[in-house]
Interface confidence: low
């Protein structure tokens, strides 16, 4: 139960990519404001986004403290201008979020091909190791730092003159593939955590093709 002029938040949804994590909810407030609390299963509640008229709250700073923990959030509704007011049960109206485990659930952001280098009939394709907001010893960790060998990349490559794609996988950020001499190739990569059951794959990177600026070519 709550006060007559407030409504409980609903559709609480976690939106998370590379650990940048925002809780969203409805409805847009009319004469009310929200405060969010977040907790691990065993921890204390911590308040964030105090008395906001937004319908989202950035909880990244909290979840990056331990991305393997499971988090729960709740959104409190208060009458605008009277945030001390409580419901008949002596507390403001609130709604719980689904549980969220960042390591298992954060979406993988679109990767970027950093470079490719041809040496004879071999091409080395390097994927940019994207920085996350997860910190260790005051430095930001890369996606690879966080996921280690749980993270792989799939490379799709094809001759510019045809549509038949080949694939390769790596659990580093580099591929070394064989190509036909004198042929130009195009490349796209996808980040994958195959051991996951949800949010296993990123969207494909932008396509990069040989003969464009990104590459470097050395014939032997």
């Amino acid at each position: 139960s709550g006060t007559t002029n407030t409504v409980a938040a609903y559709n609480l949804t976690w939106k998370s990519t590379n650990f940048k994590t925002i809780l969203e909810w409805e409805p847009k407030p009319v004469n009310q404001v929200y405060t969010v609390q977040i907790s691990t299963k065993s921890g204390d509640w911590k308040s964030k986004c105090f008395y906001t008229t937004d319908t989202e709250c950035d909880l990244t700073d909290e979840i990056v403290k331990d991305v393997k923990q499971t988090y729960l959030a709740r959104v409190f509704s208060y009458p605008a201008g009277n945030v001390e007011s409580t419901g008949s049960a002596g507390e403001p109206l609130y709604e719980n979020s689904p549980e969220f485990t960042p390591y298992l659930e954060t979406n993988l952001g679109q990767p970027t091909i950093q470079s490719f280098e041809q040496v004879g009939t071999k091409v080395n394709v390097t994927v940019e190791d994207e920085r996350t907001l997860v910190r260790r010893n005051n430095t930001f960790l890369s996606l690879r730092d966080v996921f280690g060998k749980d993270l792989i990349y799939t490379l799709y490559y094809w001759k510019s003159s045809s549509s038949g794609k080949k694939t390769a996988k790596t659990n580093t950020n580099e591929f070394l593939i064989d190509v036909d001499k004198g042929e130009n190739y195009c490349f796209s990569v996808q980040a994958v955590i195959p051991s996951r059951t949800v949010n296993r794959k990123s969207t494909d990177s932008p396509v990069e093709c040989m003969g464009q600026e990104k590459g470097e070519f050395r014939e032997i």
Epitope: K166, K169, N171, P194, S195, T197
Partner: antibody, heavy 118, light 107 residues
């Protein structure tokens, strides 16, 4: 430490069903696909199917699709494989196996021997 | 489904010598190949994945190579504890399929 502990050996009559369990520990059960592989005496390995413990969705080898059912119990971190209409050629060791990054099976149960005999 | 053909079925090698097993896929599986070791009365054990990557804790005498349809698994210097049956498996396309196995013995 990741462990997959399977139920004990079974002896069944032709036409009966058998249900083998696989209790997982040491990792997030819903975070990895669970697969079932069988091995007839003196034979090679044969993949039967896999289940997503998070959703219960499963994929089967067409050969077994009509007779095998994969289920999970998230509350006990246990996967189950039920094979119906048993025949003598189903006599085999049945393994559960956790699928790792990229697809290989990194952790295996100890195996459950199922003997089908009249 | 993809058929994996493994050869030879039996391989006898002297201690300290090289053992080589081949696996051929009926269609391209990229580098989606794993290799397993199975000792008598035991469950299979993952040795190699992505055709050439050693799994955690696997000694470096075990190696793999290949791409597309043709793959090779090598034990560079056979030890007594390597006596086992070895299987290739494609994890490129469901249904996941295994080779028929190669029994490695000491000559």
């Amino acid at each position: 430490e990741v462990q997959l502990v399977q139920s004990g050996a079974e002896v069944k009559k032709p036409g009966a069903s058998v249900k083998v369990s696989c209790k997982a520990s040491g990792y997030s059960f819903t975070g990895y696909y669970m697969n079932w592989v069988r091995q007839a005496p003196g034979q090679g390995l044969e993949w039967m199917g896999e289940i997503n413990p998070s959703t219960g969705g499963s994929t089967y080898n067409q050969k077994f699709k009509a007779r095998v059912t994969l289920t999970v119990d998230q509350s006990t971190n246990t996967a189950y494989m039920e094979l119906s209409s048993l025949r003598s050629e189903d006599t085999a060791v049945y393994y559960c196996a956790r699928r790792e990054l990229g697809g290989p099976f990194g952790y295996w149960g100890q195996g459950t021997t199922v003997t089908v005999s009249s | 489904s993809i058929v994996m053909t493994q050869s030879p079925k039996f391989l006898a090698v002297s201690l300290g010598e090289r053992a080589t097993i081949n696996c051929k896929a009926s269609q391209s599986v990229s580098n989606g190949i794993a290799w397993y070791q199975q000792k008598p009365g035991q469950s299979p054990k993952l040795l190699i994945y992505f055709a050439s990557n050693r799994y955690t804790g696997v000694p470096d005498r075990f190696s793999g190579s290949g791409y597309g349809t043709d793959f090779t698994f090598t034990i560079s210097s056979l030890q007594a504890e390597d006596v086992a049956v070895y299987y290739c498996q494609q994890d490129y396309s469901s249904p996941w399929t295994f080779g028929g196995g190669t029994k490695v013995e000491i000559k």
